[in-house]
């Protein structure tokens, strides 16, 4: 019997979207509307995901396949599988406590979510400010300013060649 | 609301294959089981086997050697083969809807079924 | 497999009457997968109890069943004439599926 191919495990032979059904000698039965089973074998089927509220579904349950949720426009997907959704802020903002606040002055943040970062420091490198920083930018670092002294080329050097052996593969 | 239709050749000869196709209309044929049951003339409902969307297979031991069923999901059909038929495989042919649970755990038994298409096998 | 035995293979009554319909299993059947269907000529069997006690969508108040383990019955309280017909006793608790020979409900 198909049921029994596995004489250790009659349940292997049930497919995903079923349960090895319990309560009727080990049968495979279809699962319940609103769940499913993503591997062959299972005892139980899983309770499909709900996207409710800030929650949107970007793809159906099926018997064999969880739903999978998005966020509603703004708000972004947080964590493993979009566990949660977080509000969106303009670029310049951050997500505070009390909602969405401007970038300190000194900081930035070009995207809709995350925290606002320092802007670059470009004297680090030896390098000088090239464009200010904004609360939406950061800073562009150019040329050192011994760079910029008289007489000194604006002009880039070639890049060296490349040793034999160590071209790109 | 979910409908069968069985279609297939009315007559067979002996020692060929008798091949019937369900389709199924009003609903998806996805998440279920579907099975075949047959009806001499005359006769009691015989159990042939059953088969899921995956393509999963029950049949009834009595015809397990002779029987191969398959579902092809995209045009929403499942289907019966039954090779080296003898007049005692004329009946009458029926598709139907496996038993199946609600999100309650309640079970629903074979709901929905074919209006059945005869088969005679006949040189 | 589990052999359902029916009884009585025919039942002569008289519209009006009550009909009682026995299904014996061979082996103990959980009453959830317990099913009656019945069947008029040349139509398709239509399923009018399942669970051994619920019936089915649109199946009238005077067909009822009940049962557990081995034994199980339909019951049609006052025949009307549309329930002259054959009634099967089906069981899909354990593979195969097994149906009873039927009983033959006719008009005395």
């Known amino acids: 019997f198909e049921r029994t191919r596995s004489l250790q495990d009659p349940c292997s032979n049930c497919p995903a979207g079923t349960f090895c059904d319990n309560n009727r000698n080990q049968i495979c039965s279809p699962c319940p509307p609103n769940s499913f089973s993503s591997a062959g074998g299972q005892r139980t089927c899983d309770i499909c995901r709900q996207c409710k509220g800030v929650f949107r579904t970007r793809k159906e349950c099926s018997s064999t396949s969880n739903a999978e949720c998005d966020c509603t426009p703004g708000f972004h997907c947080l964590g493993a599988g979009c566990s949660m959704c977080e509000q969106d802020c303009k670029q310049g903002q951050e997500l505070t406590k009390k909602g969405c606040k401007d970038c300190c002055f000194g900081t930035f943040n070009d995207q809709k979510r995350g925290i606002c970062r320092p802007w670059t420091n470009c004297s680090l490198d030896g390098k000088s400010v090239l464009v200010n920083g904004t609360k939406e930018r950061d800073v562009v670092c150019g040329p050192s300013p011994a760079d910029l002294s008289p007489g000194a080329s604006s002009v880039t050097p070639p890049a060296p060649a490349r040793e034999p052996g160590h071209s790109p593969q | 609301q979910v409908q069968l239709q069985e279609s297939g050749p009315g007559l067979v000869k002996p020692s060929e294959t008798l091949s019937l196709t369900c389709t199924v209309s009003?609903?998806?044929?996805?998440?279920?089981?579907w099975s075949w049951i047959r009806q001499p003339p005359g006769k009691g409902l015989e159990w042939i086997g059953r088969?899921?969307?995956?393509?999963?297979?029950n049949y009834n031991p009595s015809l397990k050697s002779r029987v191969t069923m398959s579902v092809d999901t995209s045009k929403n059909q499942f289907s019966l083969k039954l090779s080296s038929v003898t007049a005692a495989d004329t009946a009458v042919y029926y598709c139907?809807?496996?038993?199946?649970?609600?999100?309650?755990?309640?079970?629903?038994?074979?709901?929905?079924w074919g209006q059945g298409t005869t088969v005679t096998v006949s040189s | 497999e589990i052999v359902m035995t029916q009884s009585p293979a025919t039942l002569s009554l008289s519209p009006g009457e009550r009909a009682t319909l026995s299904c014996r299993a061979s082996?103990?059947?959980?009453?959830?997968?317990l099913s009656w269907f019945q069947q008029k000529p040349g139509q398709a069997p239509r399923l009018l109890i399942y669970?051994?006690?619920t019936r089915a969508t649109g199946i009238p108040a005077r067909f009822s069943g009940s049962g557990s383990g081995t034994d199980f019955t339909l019951t049609i309280s006052s025949l009307q004439p549309e329930d002259f017909a054959v009634y099967y006793c089906?069981?899909?608790?354990?593979?195969?599926?097994?149906f009873g020979q039927g009983t033959k409900v006719e008009i005395k």
């Open positions: 082996q103990s059947v959980s009453s959830n997968y």
């Open positions: 089906q069981q899909d608790y354990d593979l195969p599926w097994t």
């Open positions: 139907a809807r496996d038993g199946w649970y609600d999100e309650d755990y309640n079970y629903y038994g074979m709901d929905v």
């Open positions: 669970g051994a006690s």
């Open positions: 088969i899921y969307t995956s393509g999963s297979t």
């Open positions: 009003g609903g998806s044929i996805s998440s279920y089981y």
